[in-house]
């Protein structure tokens, strides 16, 4: 999240790849309209919120890390888009350490937003248990906040 400038960044990213949605009727890669972007954000929001709430209940007292910044919005395109390629590695990294079922659903949605052939970086989770928990919490909080700001921007007038 944490590109507070211009929450609509996420807005059109969804112009993108929908491998999971069968059929030649699909718009080609990169080409989903804001309406479909919004649909996918609506699917992601409860997954992200639920995952965060469950983690906070399970891991009470864990602080947010000030060393982790999830750059979930790009600034290099107009309109800006969700930087799925930057977010996915984090979710792949925390998958073994969190609710795999929900993480898989989030990854599935993020994959739909991803531009084809965009490289993903490798992310390593901190080895220290406490730092690891703090890292996971931070990712979940920042991603949830990112989705909220983007959704607000999608609802605040013309896209």
């Amino acid at each position: 999240m944490l590109s507070h400038t211009g929450p609509s960044r996420f807005a059109l990213f969804l112009l993108c790849s929908m491998e999971t949605l069968l059929s030649s009727h699909m718009a080609p890669t990169h080409q989903l309209p804001p309406s479909d972007v919004r649909k996918i954000i609506l699917e992601l929001q409860p997954l992200s919120r639920g995952l965060l709430e469950d983690y906070q209940k399970k891991e009470t007292g864990v602080p947010e890390s000030n060393r982790t910044l999830l750059l979930c919005l790009t600034s290099d395109s107009q309109p800006p888009r969700l930087n799925s390629s930057a977010i996915l590695p984090y979710f792949r990294a925390i998958r073994p350490l969190s609710d795999k079922n929900i993480i898989d659903k989030i990854i599935e949605q993020l994959d739909k937003l991803k531009f084809q052939h965009e490289p993903e970086t490798e992310i390593s989770v901190p080895a220290d248990t406490f730092e690891c928990k703090s890292f996971i919490l931070t990712i979940l909080q920042q991603f949830s906040a990112c989705l909220e700001s983007v959704f607000k921007s999608l609802n605040s007038g013309p896209q």
């Epitope: 059109l12 112009l15 929908m18 949605l21 069968l22 059929s23 009727h25 699909m26 718009a27 080609p28 990169h30 080409q31 989903l32 309209p33 804001p34 309406s35 479909d36 919004r38 649909k39 996918i40 609506l42 699917e43 409860p46 739909k112 013309p158 896209q159």
Partner: antibody, heavy 118, light 111 residues
Framework: EVQLVESGPSLVKPGGSLRLTCSVT????????WNWIRKFPGNKLEYMGY???????DYNPSLKSRITISRDTSKNQYYLQLNSVTTEDTATYYC????????????WGQGTLVTVSS | DIVMTQSPASLSVSLGQRATISCRAS??????????MHWYQQKPGQSPKLLIY???NLESGIPARFGGSGSGTDFTLTIDPVQADDVATYYC?????????FGGGTKLEIK
């Protein structure tokens, strides 16, 4: 072959609630997006909202305070409820499938005429 | 909301001639070269039937006499040659932005 069939009361009193059912065969409502659209007597079409494969709903802001779309996956049916109806809600109501992102509504029900009158 | 303006409201065409229906959106419905504009045919007593999706793609099973063109804000549905079976009301619809919106319809009659 995908088929959608609307059913429900054809007459509703002003101030009451309209509840329609869309029964789907040939596809599962746990994939794709399932929509309601209505056509007014003057032939104007209005998009009302959808329920998604996961149960997420989204509504036309013009109806948001009055509309609820729900579903029963065991029956492969989804529903439209419209509250506080007036004569302005008299229309033919259609259910329709939006199967793929970036596509269009490819299967529609035959429509059911609902008249709001006392 | 994106306002869709269709013209003409009604059209009378001789059998075998060309029918042209226009649809104008109040703002562009294009994204990365794709136009999220669709055309439907509704015959009396029937439900709408998808003819053209994304401006120019012919839906499966629809005769090649139907064609769609346009981009941005201006779109056209062409039927050439018109047959008796084409008597219907034709609607354009945008799925670019929520809420989805429709044109007012064009009623096609045979001269």
């Amino acid at each position: 072959e995908v088929q959608l069939v609307e059913s429900g009361p054809s007459l509703v009193k002003p101030g009451g609630s309209l509840r329609l059912t869309c029964s789907v065969t040939g596809d599962s409502i746990t994939s794709g997006y399932w929509n309601w659209i209505r056509k007014f007597p003057g032939n104007k079409l209005e998009y009302m909202g959808y329920i998604s494969y996961s149960g997420i709903t989204d509504y036309n802001p013009s109806l948001k305070s009055r509309i609820t779309i729900s579903r029963d996956t065991s029956k492969n049916q989804y529903y439209l409820q419209l509250n506080s109806v007036t004569t302005e809600d008299t229309a033919t109501y259609y259910c329709a499938r939006y199967g793929n992102y970036g596509y269009a509504m490819d299967y529609w029900g035959q429509g059911t005429l609902v008249t709001v009158s006392s | 909301d994106i306002v869709m303006t269709q013209s003409p409201a009604s059209l009378s065409v001789s059998l075998g001639q060309r029918a042209t229906i226009s649809c104008r959106a109040s703002e562009s419905v294009d994204t990365y070269g794709n136009s999220f504009m669709h055309w439907y045919q509704q015959k009396p007593g029937q439900s709408p039937k998808l003819l053209i999706y994304r401006a120019s793609n012919l839906e499966s099973g629809i005769p090649a006499r139907f064609g769609g063109s346009g981009s941005g804000t201006d779109f056209t549905l062409t039927i050439d040659p018109v047959q008796a079976d084409d008597v219907a009301t034709y609607y354009c619809q945008q799925s670019y932005e929520d809420p989805w919106t429709f044109g007012g319809g064009t009623k096609l009659e045979i001269k």
